[in-house]
């Protein structure tokens, strides 16, 4: 996260009576793993599974379609980012069962952590794309009729990726690897030495805008979308806003945790005690950042379940169905006829 | 009690190489590293690197890396140092010291002088 | 590699003086393991490098209580509440957390 953040036991002592609390011989130190990091290990095992297949499912239903269908071309950029970043998880997975070993060189470290926060930006970025595309299609539908399309679309995710590349540079960065010198052992981290202005001002960077600011847009955003669509009955059904809702809201919910240890870190004298409390979270906290990167398969799925009847359907038809439909206009009002045309709002982080 | 005992001073021509040894006992020796360091007349300390008898590991700081050769003899608890293609700069106490954590014991030191 | 910056590089001191020896590392300190391998060592004429203060701030067996060492993260200082005669010579800080062990261009505690 923010600090070099693993953890193995301490020296203990001397085996000499004469020096006490010193160190021990190299081979006498712990081999146990904290419980933050077997639960977050379990997190990345299933995070991994589900996300690769799921994500892929979702790639592959959407790739055809999104040459001509607008929701397709959303959904497909959002998959392709969780998918980048469960990539990253064989190897992040290894290091913590190695107590946070980084035995792939300096490269692998700036990029394989790095590509979380990619992830982070560019689903968060891709969520205020798509809430917009909402938003206009609720508000604006006379203007969505002469100018929505594939090539805009595509456009917007663009300028979507390039921010999120030009936010995570940074992070990128600052990432070195360190060795320590005993227990031998090479780790992967943020490094910026005495620089902590610059260190607070990554992390605020950060929480303001891959957190706070779309907080704030996208609560505005669909709180207008809502009170619009309930007083004209304008959805097929609240269900579809219930779920985009929850989309949303479990962006927010899994990088909560990630983010507020990040910005109480940067602020933080690394050798304090709540520094190595918050210290020792954090790979949890990351793992749990990262159920964003298999979470919005999941929310396709239940949607499509929900709307299409159980199973009734195969699963790539399911997900076709719940993805690719799009949104139709009518008149001065617009509805959506797309169950999850909205869910497509996630991130994931690393 | 720990004692570290160094070899004798060298003189040695530019060029050339020098073996000095480190005596270890009081202590298990194959469960600390052996470090070696550095002190040029008048200067600072240096780290040249360790060597771990346990699993045969040597790790050496980059400055000297083809410059010293760490070994060490189980059988008799000691360990070797190893300088090649010696140059004037490498005129210098070397120190033997027992690693794994903070240098608590130290040999008395190896003098080398490289002179034409 | 680690840079460790000692200041003064000469320190006159008059016999019962407190002495004060600053150390700042070019990057944090802190280990994994949660601890600071931050250590000091004196250095007399003619002798071998002696472990004072282990871990920031831990004497090592046979120090007198005289000496006392703080700091933490970057920043270490090393106090000689009442300087006496045994205790001039050159003062070391070195860190052990990464590797390449470093160590300060020391402090030369001498007479005034």
């Known amino acids: 996260m923010n600090s070099f953040n693993y953890t193995t036991p301490d020296y203990g002592h001397y085996d000499d009576k004469d020096t006490l609390d010193l160190n021990t011989p190299v081979d006498k130190t712990s081999n146990t793993l904290r419980v933050p990091d077997i639960l977050a290990l379990v997190i990345f095992a299933v995070v991994f599974l589900v996300g690769v297949l799921g994500n892929a499912l979702v790639v592959w239903v959407t790739a055809f379609e999104a040459k001509r269908t607008i929701n397709a071309i959303w959904f497909l950029n959002l998959a392709v980012a969780d998918f980048l970043s469960c990539l990253a998880l064989p190897i992040l997975f290894t290091s913590i069962v190695q107590h946070h070993h980084w035995p792939f060189g300096g490269a692998a470290c700036s990029i394989l952590p790095s590509l979380i926060l990619l992830n982070m930006y560019a689903s968060i970025l891709l969520l205020a794309t798509i809430s917009a595309d909402r938003f206009l299609l609720v508000f604006k539908p006379i203007w969505c009729q002469n100018f929505r399309g594939a090539g805009l679309a595509w456009i917007a995710c663009a300028v979507a990726w390039g921010l999120a590349l030009l936010l995570t540079i940074p992070s990128f960065l600052y990432r070195v690897v360190r060795e320590e010198y005993f227990p031998p052992k090479v780790l992967c981290g943020v490094d910026y030495s005495h620089d902590k202005r610059r260190e607070r001002a990554v992390a605020i960077v950060r929480l303001v805008l891959g957190f706070l600011w779309p907080l704030l847009t996208l609560t505005i955003c669909y709180t207008f979308i809502l009170l619009r669509t309930w007083s004209r009955r304008a959805t097929r059904s609240t269900k579809t806003l219930k779920v985009v809702v929850a989309v949303v809201a479990s962006f927010f919910i899994f990088w909560l945790p990630y983010q507020v240890t990040g910005i109480m870190m940067s602020f933080l004298e690394p050798s304090s005690p709540t520094f190595l409390l918050l210290n020792k979270l954090d790979s949890l906290c990351v793992s749990f950042a990262y159920i964003n990167c298999c979470i919005n398969p999941i929310i396709y799925v239940v949607a499509g379940q929900g709307f299409q009847g159980r199973l009734r359907k195969s699963l790539p038809s399911l997900l076709r169905n719940v993805l690719t439909e799009e949104s139709v206009v009518r008149e001065s009002k617009s509805f959506t006829r797309s169950t999850v045309d909205t869910m497509a709002q996630k991130t994931q982080a690393v | 009690q720990v004692q570290l005992q160094q070899s004798g001073p060298e003189l040695v021509k530019p060029g050339d190489s020098v073996k000095m040894s480190c005596k270890a006992s009081g202590y298990t020796f194959t469960d600390y590293y052996m470090d070696w360091v550095k002190q040029s007349h008048g200067k600072s300390l240096e780290w040249i690197g360790y060597f771990y008898p346990n699993n045969g590991g040597a790790k050496y700081n980059q400055k000297f890396k083809g410059k010293a050769a760490l070994t060490v003899d189980k059988s008799s608890t000691t360990a070797y140092m190893e300088l090649h293609s010696l140059t004037f700069e490498d005129s210098a106490v070397y120190y033997c010291?027992?690693?794994?954590?903070?240098?608590?014991?130290w040999g008395q030191g190896t003098l080398v002088t490289v002179s034409a | 590699d680690v840079v460790m910056t000692q200041t003064p590089l000469s320190l006159p001191v008059s016999l019962g003086d407190q002495a004060s020896i600053s150390c700042r590392s070019s990057?944090?300190?802190?280990?994994?393991?949660?601890?600071?391998?931050l250590h000091w060592y004196v250095q007399k004429p003619g002798q071998s490098p002696k472990l004072l203060i282990y871990k920031v701030s831990n004497r090592f067996s046979g120090v007198p209580d005289r000496f006392s060492g703080s700091g933490s993260g970057t920043d270490f200082t090393l106090k000689i509440s009442r300087v006496e005669a045994e205790d001039l010579g050159v003062y070391f800080c070195?860190?052990?957390?990464?590797?390449?062990?470093?160590f300060g261009a020391g402090t030369k505690l001498e007479l005034k």
């Open positions: 070195s860190q052990s957390t990464l590797v390449p062990v470093t």
């Open positions: 990057q944090s300190l802190v280990h994994s393991s949660e601890n600071t391998y």
């Open positions: 010291t027992r690693g794994s954590g903070p240098f608590a014991y």
